[in-house]
Amino acid sequence: TQNKALPENVKYGIVLDAGSSHTSLYIYKWPAEKENDTGVVHQVEECRVKGPGISKFVQKVNEIGIYLTDCMERAREVIPRSQHQETPVYLGATAGMRLLRMESEELADRVLDVVERSLSNYPFDFQGARIITGQEEGAYGWITINYLLGKFSQKTRWFSIVPYETNNQETFGALDLGGASTQVTFVPQNQTIESPDNALQFRLYGKDYNVYTHSFLCYGKDQALWQKLAKDIQVASNEILRDPCFHPGYKKVVNVSDLYKTPCTKRFEMTLPFQQFEIQGIGNYQQCHQSILELFNTSYCPYSQCAFNGIFLPPLQGDFGAFSAFYFVMKFLNLTSEKVSQEKVTEMMKKFCAQPWEEIKTSYAGVKEKYLSEYCFSGTYILSLLLQGYHFTADSWEHIHFIGKIQGSDAGWTLGYMLNLTNMIPAEQPLSTPLSHSTYV
């Protein structure tokens, strides 16, 4: 008789990433009997919630339930009903909510409270909604990519499972770019981490890791743009801002009240003799780059070396995975190839930014104008941040790998967060056991 497959003995987990610009729901799946193995958890679904980030619901919290409905219903469909009650659901909010909490702890708490009540209405095992720290965001991103790359596995493999996998067990650094913050996380080479706030110690699968991490609040791509606009409008002679970070011919009216609606622009706030101003794009990469550099204070460093704003940064070491908006932006610009040098990226950015807005709109007719208009800024910002902010060079650029997915799972903090909260990353190396009986019939 033919062998019949037994019912899959699998488990599921759900993590919602409540970012500054949007919320995404991720569903993960793994074989129940292999929980402690490295690399067995994989993503089976991503659902992007329609609408803005949850912090934007502060004046309309009653709309949060409806906002989350579609993706939660999708999770209901994807996960077998028999598994619903034992499927954990976690929501982690990042820098958008950190910024709201800076304004008011109560406001942030009210938003989270409504989120919790909404998520509790589903048949899953809801485990809570919280604002994760920037340190956690960096750490979990680092765990995610190294878990997916197989870096925690003690077995040396003669084959490579992913394009950028070197056969050694050297971990990858993690570079994460969001809308409101950016994180840099890596294991420095025999370097003392001079500031305790930036030091993490992990024991994973029997090995100790001393990890450096920092999250730069207000230096995600959206908040960096608000900062740049607030800085540049200070010196504008009238209500026209000729902006090198937007394509020639691009025009957009900005409300001054919107400009100052974030704690990130506080340092540039001033009284302007107008309520609105118009951005007029002039599309000049070099000038855009120069304007962006003014957001990084490199004049002060109380350590042996710094990134910017007086934040300690050890010498860069090893390969880095650059994900989230680092990847999305560079992918749009067609600059994610391993073969593209930093000089070539800069050249292509110069050409892209100089292209007239009308031409750009025609070439990318399917892309929303709001996003399309900001790729020149975002690409230039990524280069500025990596080169001047984090001190990558033309030579070390080749160590940056722009990663969207690894083995079908999105690179980002959510997988690492779930692995940690479900205790699926043991401190010690699990004893290798024979294949369980359920594997074959």
Epitope: Q59, R101, E103, S104, E106, L107, R110, K261, T262, K266
Partner: antibody, heavy 123, light 106 residues
């Protein structure tokens, strides 16, 4: 030291308008949420309106919604309350009050108060 | 709106004694409860924020406790300058105050 000084109060007829001002000093004004709280003669305290530090959240008590408008001018370190369609029940001392902080986070409690300005609505 | 009910309306206590003032919220307000003191002709003064934190410059004889719906302000040993009206205020929803407790000399 932190100082909040209200002005603009007075006697006004029902249905008319009045604008109150609160001049702030001794702190970085744009880093703090600001509020108006009132107290009718011989009565308790009643919150009127709030304006968070980055204007993310602007809110009003139901009793004044649609009639009063809170605003701020960070360059002048001044908070305003534009009151229109005034009623007899709006008669009160109006206090300007600053939001407090829980460590690095803003809080919706009131850590500093001005001395108040009296508004009397009477025909 | 969240209704705050203070009790008692008036409390008569002798100097040196302990005074306990209560405040009940009509719904849970977590620990977002704050206490103020007001003397005649003066603006209110913050005493306690977030249920149990002593405001700057306030003597240690003042303390606060509670969470959810039930909160207490305690003055361990009354001084003559403590006779005043005390208000509680919640900030979990848009701010609302209790009607006040008048602390008077017995």
């Amino acid at each position: 030291q932190v100082q909040l000084v209200e002005s603009g109060g007075g006697v006004v007829q029902p249905g008319r308008s009045l604008r109150l001002s609160c001049a702030a000093s001794g702190f970085t004004f744009n880093n703090y949420g600001m509020n108006w709280v009132r107290q009718a003669p011989g009565k308790g305290l009643e919150w009127v309106a709030s304006f968070s530090s980055s204007s993310t959240y602007i809110s009003y008590a139901d009793t004044v919604k649609g009639r009063f408008t809170i605003s701020r001018d960070n360059s002048k370190n001044t908070l305003y309350l534009q009151m229109s369609s005034l009623r007899a029940e709006d008669t009160a001392v109006y206090y300007c009050a600053r939001h407090g902080r829980y460590g690095g986070y803003g809080g919706f409690y009131f850590d500093y108060w001005g001395q108040g300005t009296m508004v009397t609505v009477s025909s | 709106e969240t209704v705050m009910t203070q009790s008692p309306a008036t409390l008569s206590v002798s100097p040196g004694e302990r005074a306990t003032l209560s405040c009940r919220a009509s719904e849970g307000v977590k620990s977002y409860m704050h206490w103020y003191q007001q003397k005649p002709g003066q603006a209110p003064r913050l005493l306690i924020y977030k249920a149990s934190n002593l405001a700057s410059g306030i003597p240690a004889r003042f303390s606060g406790s509670g969470s959810g719906t039930e909160f207490t302000l305690t003055i361990s040993s009354l001084q003559s300058e403590d006779f005043a009206v005390y208000y509680c205020q919640q900030s979990w929803n848009d701010p609302t105050f209790g009607q006040g407790t008048k602390l008077e000399l017995k």
